[in-house]
């Protein structure tokens, strides 16, 4: 039994690091393998992760961590019974994939404005809490070409857009993801999407001027 692709790990910089690797043949990861991990620090204990299968020869392990600081370094040992298959190390701060934002809500109670809000996936004591920026993806269920991304580069987890920038009378979906420049993270997964029906009515005068204005462009 040999490791074909060495473990690579990403951290959510809070409590979970996920390591994936491939073996040289079909493997029952949970019965045949163990990934031992230990923070390089005083008093730290070795922990054992029981991997799960991820395809025929692939394995994945979710390493649980109490907390994380920038300087953290973990030793990783992959065992098959008494045989050490691979030894390595992992610095969570150098391989961060943020948690996905949650609770995405579209507020349509203001007739001409859509307010999208979501929750920061980190608690205030986490460094990433104040360092996330977001991308909001809005698309039409009726028209695959009607697909847009809004970059939210401020800290507040919200986005305001004019309802008139979207087509009226059709359904849209939105989702949001996060990243942090400070640790050069990858993007998080997308949040679950939320759906709403976009309907707005402009007063006749405004409607008239709008088209007049549009004509000049």
């Amino acid at each position: 039994m040999k490791v074909l692709q060495e473990p690579t790990c990403v951290s959510d910089y809070m409590s979970i690091s996920t390591c994936e690797w491939k073996m040289n043949g079909p493997t029952n990861c949970s019965t045949e393998l163990r990934l031992l991990y230990q923070l390089v620090f005083l008093l730290s204990e070795a922990h054992t992760c029981i991997p799960e299968n991820n395809g025929g020869a692939g394995c994945v392990c979710h390493l649980l961590m109490d907390d994380v600081v920038s300087a953290d370094n973990y030793t990783l040992d992959l065992w098959a019974g008494q045989q050490l298959l691979w030894k390595g190390s992992f610095k969570p701060s150098e391989h961060v994939k943020p948690r996905a934002p949650g609770n995405l809500t579209v507020h349509t109670n203001v007739s001409d404005t859509l307010l999208l809000t979501w929750s920061n996936p980190y608690p205030p004591d986490n460094y990433l809490y104040n360092h996330l920026t977001y991308a909001v993806n809005i698309w039409s269920e009726n028209d695959p070409a009607d697909f847009r991304i809004y970059n939210v580069t401020y800290l507040e987890p919200s986005l305001r857009i004019a309802a008139s920038t979207l087509k009226s009378g059709i359904s849209y979906r939105a989702r949001v993801r996060a990243w942090a420049q400070c640790y050069n993270t990858t993007w998080s997964e997308w949040s679950p999407s939320t759906k709403w029906h976009n309907s707005y009515r402009e007063p006749f005068e405004q409607h008239h001027h709008h088209h007049h204005h549009h004509h000049h462009h």
């Epitope: 409590s15 390089v40 005083l42 649980l64 907390d67 600081v69 300087a71 953290d72 205030p124």
Partner: antibody, heavy 116, light 112 residues
Framework: EVQLVQSGAEVKKPGATVKISCKAS????????MHWVKQAPGKGLEWMGR????????IYASKFQGKATITADTSSNTAYMELSSLRSEDTAVYHC?????????WGQGTLVTVSS | DIVMTQTPLSLSVTPGQPASISCRSS???????????LEWYLQKPGQSPQLLIY???NRFSGVPDRFSGSGSGTDFTLKISRVEAEDVGVYYC?????????FGQGTKLEIK
């Protein structure tokens, strides 16, 4: 041996500022969060705030926001706390504590007395 | 802020007898990572506090096995199975799950 050695007792006048130090030995403060805890005479323990020494990220209990400023110098392996606009109610023993992820190591405490 | 309420505030125990201290949090102290950072500290007279129990039930290294922690949700207990003279001092519970972190008001244990 792991130790947190704090600077000595201070007597200050109301309105003054004091800066307490906490030097770590036996471990690198970059590997922990450094916290400060207040203990007024005859009273209990009060969490003040903490710093991640590597990136300087601090959080404070709202009561100590604007009163306490926590800093760290990783080159000297030392954490600091500055208390400003001192008043008589700031008279207390202040403990530095390393947390990873519990308070395993405490400094001996620094008594700050505010008196005119 | 989460308020940690300890009972009783003082306790007088005969050596060899058990002792129990309760700590109740004003709301859940389960961290968003799923762990409960409830700890117990003992401050002996003239000393800095020392860690006894972390994550509700785990004894810190060097802590005698007569100390045990239990509980979940908002109700937690520290038990000393047989009190010894060296156990005197003030016991504090602490929650490190939600900012601002908070201590209980302390329980003073004395020997009869």
């Amino acid at each position: 041996e792991v130790q947190l050695v704090q600077s000595g007792a201070e007597v200050k006048k109301p309105g003054a500022t004091v800066k307490i130090s906490c030097k770590a030995s036996g471990f690198n403060i970059k590997d922990t969060y450094m916290h400060w805890v207040k203990q007024a005479p005859g009273k209990g323990l009060e969490w003040m705030g903490r710093i991640d020494p590597t990136n300087g990220y601090t959080i404070y209990a709202s009561k100590f926001q604007g009163k306490a400023t926590i800093t760290a110098d990783t080159s000297s392996n030392t954490a600091y706390m500055e208390l400003s606009s001192l008043r008589s109610e700031d008279t207390a023993v202040y403990h530095c504590v390393s947390r990873r992820p519990w308070f395993a190591y405490w400094g001996q405490g620094t008594l700050v007395t505010v008196s005119s | 802020d989460i308020v940690m309420t300890q009972t009783p505030l003082s306790l007088s125990v005969t050596p060899g007898q058990p002792a129990s201290i309760s700590c109740r949090s004003s709301q859940s102290i389960v961290h968003s990572n799923g762990n409960t950072y409830l700890e117990w500290y003992l401050q002996k007279p003239g000393q800095s506090p020392q860690l006894l129990i972390y994550k509700v039930t785990n004894r810190f290294s060097g802590v005698p096995d007569r100390f045990s922690g239990s509980g979940s949700g908002t109700d937690f207990t520290l038990k000393i199975s047989r009190v010894e003279a060296e156990d005197v001092g003030v016991y504090y519970c602490f929650q490190g799950s939600h900012v601002p972190y908070t201590f209980g008001q302390g329980t003073k244990l004395e020997i009869k």
